[in-house]
């Protein structure tokens, strides 16, 4: 039994780091493998992660962490029984994938303005809380070409757009994702999408 693709890990910079790897053949990850991880700290102890299958030869493990700070470094040991298959390390702050924003809501009752709001996925005491920026994706269910991205570079989790920038009388969907420049993170997953019917009063044409 050998590791074909070494584990790569990403952290949500809160409580979970996810490591993925591939074996050289079909493997029952949860019965055959264990990933041991330990914070490099005088008084820490090793924790065991039981991996799950992620495709035939792929495995994934969700490492539980109390919290994360920039200096944290973890040692990782991948075991198959008594055999050490791979040894490595992981610094969560250097491999951050933020949590996806939640509770995306479209408020259509503001005069001819669409107000999109969502929730910051981090609690206020987490470092990323004040460092997230967002991308909002809006698309038409009827017209695949009607697809747009709005970059929200301010901290407030909201976006206002004129309803007239979208077509009237058709249904739209929106979703939002996050990233943090300070840690050069990857983008989060997209939030679940939300749907609304776009309608607004056309202004009277003056002749």
């Amino acid at each position: 039994m050998k590791v074909l693709q070494e584990p790569t890990c990403v952290s949500d910079y809160m409580s979970i780091s996810t490591c993925e790897w591939k074996m050289n053949g079909p493997t029952n990850c949860s019965t055959e493998l264990r990933l041991l991880y330990q914070l490099v700290f005088l008084l820490s102890e090793a924790h065991t992660c039981i991996p799950e299958n992620n495709g035939g030869a792929g495995c994934v493990c969700h490492l539980l962490m109390d919290d994360v700070v920039a200096a944290d470094n973890y040692t990782l040991d991948l075991w198959a029984g008594q055999q050490l298959l791979w040894k490595g390390s992981f610094k969560p702050s250097e491999h951050v994938k933020p949590r996806a924003p939640g509770n995306l809501t479209v408020h259509t009752n503001v005069s001819d303005t669409l107000l999109l709001t969502w929730s910051n996925p981090y609690p206020p005491d987490n470092y990323l809380y004040n460092h997230l920026t967002y991308a909002v994706n809006i698309w038409s269910e009827n017209d695949p070409a009607d697809f747009r991205i709005y970059n929200v570079t301010y901290l407030e989790p909201s976006l206002r757009i004129a309803a007239s920038t979208l077509k009237s009388g058709i249904s739209y969907r929106a979703r939002v994702r996050a990233w943090a420049q300070c840690y050069n993170t990857t983008w989060s997953e997209w939030s679940p999408s939300t749907k609304w019917h776009n309608s607004y009063r056309e202004p009277f044409e003056q002749h």
């Epitope: 005088l42 008084l43 102890e45 700070v69 200096a71």
Partner: antibody, heavy 116, light 111 residues
Framework: EVQLLESGGGLVQPGGSLRLSCAAS????????MAWVRQAPGKGLEWVSA????????YYADSVKGRFTISRDNSKNTLYLQMNSLRAEDTAVYYC?????????WGQGTLVTVSS | QSVLTQPPSASGTPGQRVTISCSGS????????FNWYQQLPGTAPKLLIY???HRPSGVPDRFSGSKSGTSASLAISGLRSEDEADYYC???????????LGGGTKLTVLG
């Protein structure tokens, strides 16, 4: 709410022994390393000893090595410090502290006086 | 003598910004993170800053920490009378397999 309550302090003669206890509540005791820190009257803080969550690894300050023994009973949520061959310079308030990178919660302390 | 050196005293007037330093000796390893504790008169110490610059929940953002090499600093802005206390820095020393604490700094709020 995290609470740490020390007990077992008192007056002891030089060369004598005492056993301090620290009853923990409000958190999962078995998941946290613990430590003892002391403070002599009018002096600064001095780290004494620390123990990992399972008790597998133990550390002592040079000043107490060979005389003090730290231990824990995770089933009772209690930390202990057995102090033998006590000296006058061990006179201090002894604090029990939870460890999460630093000493993030402290008890109110128990006074140990070593005097003849 | 502590391997972490702090000034024995510091002072400031209400509203001022005060900084307390904590210096490791030249041979002190710079890999560890610094922590800061506040001890109000007659009470147990309380964690103020951990891992160089992180504040536990409940600690006002008037308190901030920073690290440079083997030294660290605690800054208190908008000084208040209730900040009058002893402040200690500390760090895990992996060469000693133990925890080292500075001698403490007594902060006095004047006037």
């Amino acid at each position: 709410e995290v609470q740490l309550l020390e007990s077992g302090g008192g007056l002891v003669q030089p060369g004598g022994s005492l056993r301090l206890s620290c009853a923990a509540s409000g958190f999962t005791f078995s998941r946290h390393a613990m430590a003892w820190v002391r403070q002599a009257p009018g002096k600064g803080l001095e780290w004494v000893s620390a123990i990992t969550s399972s008790g597998r690894s133990i550390y002592y300050a040079d000043s107490v090595k060979g005389r003090f023994t730290i231990s824990r009973d995770n089933s009772k949520n209690t930390l202990y410090l057995q102090m033998n061959s006590l000296r006058a310079e061990d006179t201090a308030v002894y604090y029990c502290a939870r460890v999460h990178r630093a000493f993030d919660y402290w008890g109110q302390g128990t006074l140990v006086t070593v005097s003849s | 003598q502590s391997v972490l050196t702090q000034p024995p005293s510091a002072s400031g007037t209400p509203g001022q910004r005060v900084t307390i330093s904590c210096s490791g000796s030249p041979l002190f390893p710079d890999s560890g993170s610094f922590n800061w504790y506040q001890q109000l008169p007659g009470t147990a110490p309380k964690l103020l800053i951990y891992a160089d610059s992180h504040r536990p929940s409940g600690v006002p953002d008037r308190f901030s920490g920073s690290k440079s090499g083997t030294s660290a600093s605690l800054a208190i802005s908008g000084l208040r009378s209730e900040d009058e206390a002893d402040y200690y820095c500390g760090t895990w020393d992996y060469s000693l397999s133990g925890y080292v604490l500075g001698g403490g700094t007594k902060l006095t709020v004047l006037g």
